[in-house]
């Protein structure tokens, strides 16, 4: 069993290394920024990410592309719930520095938990998405 788990971990690691989780990150950021824009947040505030949604994109244009590609990537983990959880954790960790304030972080986490379901996939049970302070990119 231990040997199998070791192989499973290794397989998951290589799957994660080949996965492109950026579309998921963009899709989620679009979602929470669209929500915030409707509450009066300045949609033209600058971003460090060259592919962060423009104000034009945030109104919904282009977002289906990020979602479609994101779902394709998550679909690769469908047979391995633990690995799916690790992918979600990686998304959370990669974006944690870009999330402004506790409220945005909670909103991002909520959307992230719903992501597999949104893609028509099984959501991993008991997947801890808490990020230790100073989370950094694993890319």
């Amino acid at each position: 069993r231990q040997q199998w788990e070791l192989q499973g971990d290794r397989r998951c690691q290589s799957q994660l290394e080949r996965a492109n989780l950026r579309p998921c990150e963009q899709h989620l950021m679009q979602k929470i920024q669209r929500d915030e824009d409707s509450y009066g947040r300045d949609p033209y505030s600058p971003s460090q990410d060259p592919y962060s949604p423009s104000p034009y994109d945030r109104r919904g244009a282009g977002s289906s592309q990020h979602q479609e590609r994101c779902c394709n990537e998550l679909n690769e983990f469908e047979n391995n719930q633990r690995c799916m959880c690790e992918a979600l954790q990686q998304i959370m960790e990669n974006q944690s520095d870009r999330l402004q304030g506790r409220q945005q972080e909670q909103q991002f986490k909520r959307e992230l938990r719903n992501l597999p379901q949104q893609c028509g996939l099984r959501a991993p049970q008991r997947c801890d998405l808490e990020v230790e302070s100073g989370g950094r990119d694993r890319y």
């Epitope: 080949r18 592919y51 034009y56 282009g62 592309q65 479609e68 590609r69 690769e76 890319y139």
Partner: antibody, heavy 123, light 108 residues
């Protein structure tokens, strides 16, 4: 050397079938999404089909849906395109292309292409 | 499906001149999913730009890409003899992953 080599093209009658293959070498085949793209004589590029790393997501152009089937064998580093109910309009050079992405920013692109195999559908 | 329309169909210019190629989408395309390819007669396509504005490995800096939403542009600042070819834009965000019909860049 990273390489893709297509084979299986030829002359076939309308309504006939053909199976194209693409042999990959010089890279870890199972790490990449793969695509088929075709080009009719004197025309532009037309995307035909794509398949993800573990074959879990497959897409087709509307023009070939229900007639063509893409598949891959990661153990043999090969990509296939089964073409049934062929039409005159399917006459083209068929390219196999590897899809990669920019690790830091995320965009996808087809960075490695084969030289193509020619399919002629004619009575 | 997203339809990409390239213009002009043919562009006749001389070496040293500036070339501006346009790619217009029927609906918004995220920059992340806009790619440009170059193809010479009898050859397979070659990756030129991805993410709308990032040059692929080995592509000289006279090539640049810009645009967002539905309007994208490929610019070649000073044409070299080897740049005369057909150029295609492609979107790969929504299936089917469509190509534009191409712009032929020919020597005047």
């Amino acid at each position: 050397e990273v390489q893709l080599v297509e084979s299986g093209g030829g002359l076939v009658k309308p309504g006939g079938s053909l199976r194209l293959s693409c042999a990959a070498s010089g890279f870890i085949f199972s790490d990449y999404n793969m695509n088929w793209v075709r080009q009719a004589p004197g025309k532009g590029l037309e995307w035909v089909s794509s398949i993800t790393r573990s074959s879990r997501t497959i897409y087709y152009a509307d023009s070939v849906k229900g007639r063509f089937t893409i598949s891959r064998d990661n153990a043999k580093n090969s990509l296939h395109l089964q073409m049934n109910s062929l039409r005159d309009a399917d006459t083209a050079v068929y390219y196999c292309a590897r899809e990669d992405f920019d690790v830091s920013t995320g965009p996808y692109y087809m960075d490695v292409w084969g030289n193509g195999t020619t399919v002629i559908v004619s009575s | 499906e997203i339809v990409l329309t390239q213009s002009p169909g043919t562009l006749s210019l001389s070496p040293g001149e500036r070339a501006t190629l346009s790619c217009r989408a029927s609906q918004s395309v995220s920059n992340m999913f806009l790619v440009w390819y170059q193809q010479k007669p009898g050859q397979a396509p070659r990756l030129l730009m991805y993410g709308a504005s990032t040059r692929a490995t080995g592509i000289p800096d006279r090539f640049s890409g810009s645009g967002s939403g539905t309007d994208f542009t490929l610019t070649i600042s000073r044409l070299e003899p080897e740049d005369f070819a057909v150029y295609y834009c492609q979107q790969n965000g929504n299936s089917p992953y469509t190509f534009g019909q191409g712009t032929k860049l020919e020597i005047k």
